[in-house]
Structure formats: C-alpha cells, structure tokens
C-alpha cells in the first residue's frame, strides 16, 4: 500500500476579515493510525491551531467529524477572521507513539491572505488660521487595511489636487498597513465655503470608496477691507460717517471708533450679513455734530479681527467747511487731540 | 474576455418572486463590485444599488428597499436579483454591471438585459 | 441625492453634423461622470469615464470635457451608427443618478 500523503489542494485562500475562513486538508490513507493537528507557521516556533487529539480551540470547527473511524477529511474552518489569523497553514499527520505521537508528514501549506477594509480617512488641517495666499497642510490618515496596495486621492472645490506626498506603513510585510498623505493647499479668498476631501480606494471597498473631509472655514482667516464715508444728514450740522467693514471670516471682530486718536466707542460685530461667498460685511456709524468742533477732526475707524493686529481707515472733518462739500478719506495713522464733542449711534446692516 | 451573462425573460403575476441570475466570466469575481439597473419601457436608467462581491454587503437605493434583494453564488461567479410580491411596475428591463474599484468606479462591463413582464 | 439634469431630450441632426450633448449635476461630482450609449434592444455602452476618459474602441470622434458640475460629450461627425440614446451617470455618490438621456435621430 502507497505511503499516506497530506494533500492541502489550495496554495493560498483570501477571506475578508469578519469572514470564516476554510483550510482544506486530505489524507490518502488512514494509516498510521495517530492524529491530525494544524498549525500556523513552520519550525520551532510554530503556533498550534487545531489538534484533533485534545484541547480548547473555541474558534475551530472540523468540516467532517473526526470521530468517524474511516474518516480522512481532515479540513477546518476558522471563525472572525482578522488581519493577525494570515500566514501559512500546516495540516501535520501524527503517528502514535508512547509516549508522545510523532510527526509523520505534512502538508504543503496554506496561505491565508486576509482582506480588511481600511478605517474612514481622518483629515486635520493646520492648528492656527490663515489667509488667502498662503499655502496650508493637510493630512489624511487611514488604517487597518489589507492587502497593502491602495489609492489615496485628495480634492478640493471639483478639482483632483496633485500637491501631495503619501506613505503606506510598514513598508515590509505586515498583518495589516496604515496610509498618511499630506496634502499643499492655496487658500483663496473664495475657500470659506471649499471643503479639501481625501479620498481612499482599496480592493475590500468595491463600490463606494471612504472619504474624510476638512472644511476650509475652520482653516481661513479672510481679513476685511474698509471703507469710511460721510453722508450728510438734515440738520444742516451733523454729519453721518460711517465705517464698511466688508469681506471678512470669521465673524469675530471688535470696532473702535477714535475721535483724533482717542477711543470714542467700542463695539463687536453682531449682526452682519453673510455674502455669497460665505465672508461677512458688517457697518458702524456715528453721527457728529460739526457744529460742537472749532479745529478739523481726524475720525478713525479700528478694526480688530480674529485676535489680529488691528487694521485702520481715517477720515479728516473739515469742521470750517460746509457738511455737504466735505469727502476726504485718508488711511492716515491716528494722531492725538482731546477734543471729545461728538455724538454717535452705530447701526448695523 | 469579461463577459456577464444574464438569464432570459420572465412573465410573472402580480404577487410573485422573480429571480434573476448574472453569470460573470473573464475576471475574478470577488474583485468587483455587482450592479443593478431598472430600465422601465421607453424610460431611462434607474441604478437600484450593488453588491460587494468580496463581503456580501448589499446597497439599495431608496426606491428599491424592501421587495428587492442581491444574493451571490460566489463559487459559480453568478450575482442574483430577486424581486419579490412583484407589482405592475416592476415591468422592465434590468441589467446587471460590473462596477470598478481604485480611482475608478463607473460601471465598465454590462449584462445584455433580463426583460420582466408583471401582468395578470 | 445629486441631480443630473440633461437639458435636451433628443437631437434632430444630420450625418457628418457635430453634436454637443451637456449634463449638469446639482453638486461638484469631481469628474466622476460616465457616458453611455444605448441602442435599441442593446445594452448601454460605457464610452466615458472620469468625464474624459475615453474607453478602449470608442471611436475618436467622441470627446468628454467638464469640470465641476457641468459635463459635455461630444460627436466631431456624426456617423449612422451613432444614432443611439446618450446617457450621463455621476459616480462620485450613492446613489448613482443617471441623466434622463438624449436621443439622437437623423434629420
């Protein structure tokens, strides 16, 4: 009679993680008489997985049942699959001995890839604000993926960006792999409304691939520009000036208004009103009474944005002129006088 | 070459199961995914959802959960629609796709159609 | 769900005639958009993908261009055995969404 042979016909196997995994193994004969047991791995420092003969192996089933005297389907399967059951599979026949069974053959192995899908990208954008112009980085993080090959785009506003640089970890061989991209962004003022998406591919995926986004409204500073004007009003000495503080984000923003360098009134931003562009437009103004002034005033509006170094626009009131020819607007530094003699009210649009 | 093969027409009562068979060959068929498309008589294409090959999962679009269901033959590379207590408008053509995966998802490879009439 | 709007539902045209057939999408599909063509009785035809991608044995006398939202296809000179339904499909979000289609028939 021919010498029994192991016959494991399947060279590799691919399950998803989560899956039951199948390790097929025959014997040609059943003699010798002695159990059958797998393990993973070869050599001294193989891991047991199986042994017919005795043991707890709470995530093993038989194919076939073992106990039957003709039986030489030796085939198990293996329950919840995760990245950490992949490596060879030996399907190894004992001969029974005294007082220890020893090995007689093994199969050829089996090679269990195990697929798992990578985690939903995370994508972080820079820790401070920044403005138009500049460029800014953003990383995407995926891990726990199996096999290590995958795809990692990143978007912004319809368009695929190409300012990027990716790692896939470990570079040898490994359970599972982890993906880190690092993505270059010029921020516009148009961004308050961008989202910048990172986008993952992998085999396990199929239909839908995984997205993380980053909203560019937590990464933009837009600053605002300002415009001060004077508008007459009825009485023919009072004079309405006011301060347009247009285009900014975020909404944080403190308004001082110095009467020749000295604070008149302070006030935050309250009720603006959003642009399409997802930036903000707000107005102050102060209604002064010309006829309280003997010298020429300097009006300063200040505005402080998002912790910022505050930007200003002045305005001179010729106070010997007539209110209704007066029109200078100026970006002059404050300057310092005491006069206090005007009265004001702010609105807001 | 990729070819997906799908079963013939079906004249069914209102109230019964059809089921409809997708053979696919030339490719390994749990590296993609499997769709499915209603196209109603004289009507444009409706997606109804897909199957991941690989895990089982299935995906409905909205109008089609509940009475339709993916199933798969893994080791026959055959992906099945079966629709249940079928309705007068479930009346259509429905065509299995195979659908891609990395950088490009589209739907490359068709099935030539499975015709469904639904009458009493 | 993202909308796809094709805005003529058929053509008139005449052979050798170039055709432009657009479709605009209710979001940014970041040129995740197919073409397809189907004939009578037929199967659709991928022609497109990645909104300009031009498939393996599509004649080149067909062209995909867009960004964005809006998406156009082109036939440089329109043969006989292009008479066929044109379909967009966007492929960015679950769930897919075709265009209702553009038919073309000869003058």
């Known amino acids: 009679e021919e010498e029994l042979q192991v016959i494991q016909p399947d060279k590799s196997v691919l399950v998803a993680a989560g899956e039951t995994a199948t390790l097929r193994c025959t014997a040609t004969s059943l003699i010798p008489v002695g159990p059958i047991q797998w393990f993973r791995g070869a050599g001294p420092g193989r891991e047991l997985i199986y042994n017919q003969k005795e043991g707890h192996f709470p995530r093993v089933t038989t194919v076939s049942d073992l106990t039957k005297r003709n039986n030489m389907d030796f085939s198990i399967r293996i329950g919840n699959i995760t990245p950490a059951d992949a490596g060879t599979y030996y399907c190894v026949k004992f001969r029974k001995g005294s007082p220890d069974d020893v090995e007689f053959k093994s199969g050829a192995g089996t090679e269990l890839s195990v697929r798992a899908k990578p985690s939903a990208p995370v994508v972080s954008g820079p820790a401070a604000r920044a403005t138009p112009q500049h460029t800014v980085s953003f990383t995407c993080e995926s891990h726990g993926f199996s096999p290590r090959d995958i795809t990692l785009k990143w978007f912004k506003n319809g368009n695929e960006l190409s300012d990027f640089q990716t790692n896939v970890d470990p570079v040898g061989e490994s359970v599972s792999y982890s993906i880190h991209s690092t993505a270059k962004v010029v921020l516009t003022r148009e961004d308050v409304h961008s989202q910048v998406i990172c986008e993952v591919a992998h085999v396990t995926l199929q239909g839908d691939p995984l997205r993380g986004t980053a909203n560019l409204s937590e990464t933009i500073r837009v600053p605002p520009t300002l415009e001060v004007t004077q508008q007459p009003v009825r009485a023919e000495n009072q004079v309405n000036v006011t301060c347009q503080v247009r285009k900014f984000y975020p909404q944080r923003l403190q308004l001082t208004w110095l009467e020749n360098g000295n604070v008149s009134r302070t006030e935050t931003a309250s009720t603006v009103t959003e642009n399409k562009d997802g930036t903000y437009n707000w107005m102050s103004w102060l209604l002064v009474n010309v006829s309280a002034h003997r010298d020429d005033v300097k009006l300063t509006c200040q505005v402080e944005h998002d912790g910022q170094p505050a930007v200003s626009k002045s305005h001179d009131l010729k106070v010997s002129a007539h209110p209704k020819e007066q029109g200078s607007n100026t970006a002059a530094e404050n300057t310092g006088s005491n006069e206090r003699n005007i009265y004001h009210h702010h609105h807001h649009h | 070459q990729i070819q997906l093969v799908q079963s013939g027409p079906e004249l069914k009562k209102p109230g019964e199961t059809v089921k409809i068979s997708c053979k696919a060959s030339?490719?390994?068929?749990?590296?993609?995914?499997m769709h499915w498309v209603k196209q109603a008589p004289g009507k444009g294409l409706k997606w109804m959802g897909w199957?991941?090959?690989?895990?089982?999962?299935?995906t409905y679009a909205e109008d089609f959960k509940g009475r339709f269901a993916f199933f798969l033959e893994t080791s026959a590379s055959t992906a099945y629609l079966q629709i249940n207590n079928v309705k007068n408008e479930d009346t259509a053509t429905y065509f299995c796709?195979?659908?891609?995966?990395?950088?490009?998802?589209?739907?490359?490879?068709w099935g030539q159609g499975t015709s469904v009439i639904v009458s009493s | 769900d993202i909308q796809m709007t094709q805005s003529s539902s058929s053509f008139s045209v005449s052979l050798g005639d170039r055709v432009t057939i657009t479709c605009k999408a209710s979001?940014?599909?970041?040129?995740?958009l197919a073409w397809y063509q189907q004939k009578p009785g037929n199967a659709p035809r991928l022609l497109i993908s990645?909104?300009?991608s031009l498939e393996t044995g599509v004649p080149s006398r067909f062209s995909g261009s867009g960004s964005g939202k809006d998406y156009t296809l082109s036939i440089t000179s329109l043969q006989t055995e292009d008479v066929a339904t044109y379909y967009c499909?966007?492929?960015?979000?679950?769930?897919?969404?075709f265009g209702g289609g553009t038919k073309l028939e000869i003058k």
């Open positions: 796709a195979r659908g891609g995966y990395g950088s490009n998802y589209v739907m490359d490879y």
């Open positions: 030339g490719y390994t068929f749990t590296d993609y995914a």
């Open positions: 199957k991941n090959t690989e895990t089982g999962e299935s």
């Open positions: 979001e940014d599909i970041y040129n995740r």
């Open positions: 990645g909104a300009t």
């Open positions: 499909q966007q492929y960015w979000n679950s769930p897919r969404t």
